[in-house]
Amino acid sequence: VGGYICEENSVPYQVSLNSGYHFCGGSLISEQWVVSAGHCYKSRIQVRLGEHNIEVLEGNEQFINAAKIIRHPKYNSRTLDNDILLIKLSSPAVINSRVSAISLPTAPPAAGTESLISGWGNTLSSGADYPDELQCLDAPVLSQAECEASYPGKITNNMFCVGFLEGGKDSCQGDAGGPVVSNGELQGIVSWGYGCAQKNRPGVYTKVYNYVDWIKDTIAANSHHHHHH
């Protein structure tokens, strides 16, 4: 909501999760792994990389089925705590200028830092308008105090807020699982919010920094390295 059409393939790590239709976003973090939101879990997912217009085959797409879909073991569907999901692709993505991985964070998100949020979600705060072309939004990371004041009792240490307290610009339905990137690092995953782009109701995002070890351990545990004795 309140964003702009991204320059074509300018968000090369952005993926669309498809189950016959786009339902969530995600981020490519290595040639064979994608991170998304826990609440985007489905038993069968096709990962679509290199997308810009999701309704048109433009020639840069890679469609790869999910081989493994791993939701965080402490995901809470009621509070959306630990809202993170890993997808192993059935075959590695071909990395190029239009499809490439985003780095995991080396430090937690800092208040005031500009970030890029992207997705194919609803662009209206009231009603619906689902775009075909990838939308981008530049928005600042908010302080944890502002975040907690916006959603008293709802914000865990695994969440942070990004956006504008005055409303008007935000992620929305269909953006879930998608990236929040600051300084070339994946800091957030689109998670939840009360409405979209409402005053004093900024978007809430999964704090990826808290899951770097889990991500690395999960990838290691699900990689086939055959040891010959």
Epitope: H39, Y194, G195
Partner: antibody
Framework: QVQLVQSGAEVKKPGASVKVSCKAS????????MHWVRQAPGQGLEWMGS????????NYAQKFQGRVTMTRDTSISTAYMELSRLRSDDTAVYYC?????????????????????WGQGTTVTVSS | EIVMTQSPATLSVSPGERATLSCRAS??????LAWYQQKPGQAPRLLIY???TRATGIPARFSGSGSGTEFTLTISSLQSEDFAVYYC??????????FGGGTKVEIK
């Protein structure tokens, strides 16, 4: 159980106004959009507009802009649709319908909207 | 405004037979489509949402398919209680929410 109960039939003169109520029960009223749909005799379904009961925000079909007003009273879990400057072609059955997109704890996965619960309908007859 | 077109306007089918109803959108609506059944003197009833998901309590003989601009509602074996008018509706781009003109399924 979850239900929407509408007010009774109305007979109005051309130029008058009518206000139809829709009382919700069995669920959190402020958590779901409420829409209004009408159906003229022998015709199809026509969307008139919607209200977000949490904020009071509205969306109206262009055809009804300036003539329709949708309001709600959260204390009694009731939505209202008022149509003014009535004409004979406003004779129809008016329905309220709930859209089960939770407005509060709102996950940002693509939600699949639909009108899952409907009121029983209110017949409005406009005749001189 | 997205225009929804249903065909045929009337479908004559014998009980026990299969009925296939079509709904076409003037532009892509993704999977944001619902189907309703309406019997005379009654409010519509939700059958299918998200193009293919059956609503609670809807018998398995009702199935929805399609995405983008072409959608189908199939009733695998018509029962006497299935003779009614069926409407499709898009939620992809609104306001306005738009319905198809309806398909009347009548006894052959």
């Amino acid at each position: 159980q979850v239900q929407l109960v509408q007010s009774g039939a109305e007979v109005k003169k051309p130029g008058a106004s009518v206000k139809v109520s829709c009382k919700a029960s069995g669920y959190t009223f402020t958590g779901y959009y409420m829409h209004w749909v009408r159906q003229a005799p022998g015709q199809g379904l026509e969307w008139m507009g919607s209200i977000n009961p949490s904020s009071g925000g509205t969306n109206y079909a262009q055809k009804f802009q300036g003539r329709v007003t949708m309001t709600r009273d959260t204390s009694i879990s009731t939505a209202y649709m008022e149509l003014s400057r009535l004409r004979s072609d406003d004779t129809a059955v008016y329905y309220c319908a709930r859209d089960p997109v939770l407005l509060l704890r709102q996950q940002r996965i693509l939600h699949e909207s639909a009108f899952d619960i409907w009121g029983q309908g209110t017949t409005v007859t406009v005749s001189s | 405004e997205i225009v929804m077109t249903q065909s045929p306007a009337t479908l004559s089918v014998s009980p026990g037979e299969r009925a296939t109803l079509s709904c076409r959108a003037s532009q892509s609506v993704g999977s944001n489509l619902a189907w309703y059944q309406q019997k005379p003197g009654q409010a519509p009833r939700l059958l299918i949402y998200g193009a293919s998901t059956r609503a609670t309590g809807i018998p398995a003989r009702f199935s929805g398919s399609g995405s983008g601009t072409e959608f189908t509602l199939t009733i695998s074996s018509l029962q006497s209680e299935d003779f009614a008018v069926y409407y499709c509706q898009q939620f992809h781009n609104w306001p306005p929410l738009t319905f198809g003109g309806g398909t009347k399924v009548e006894i052959k």
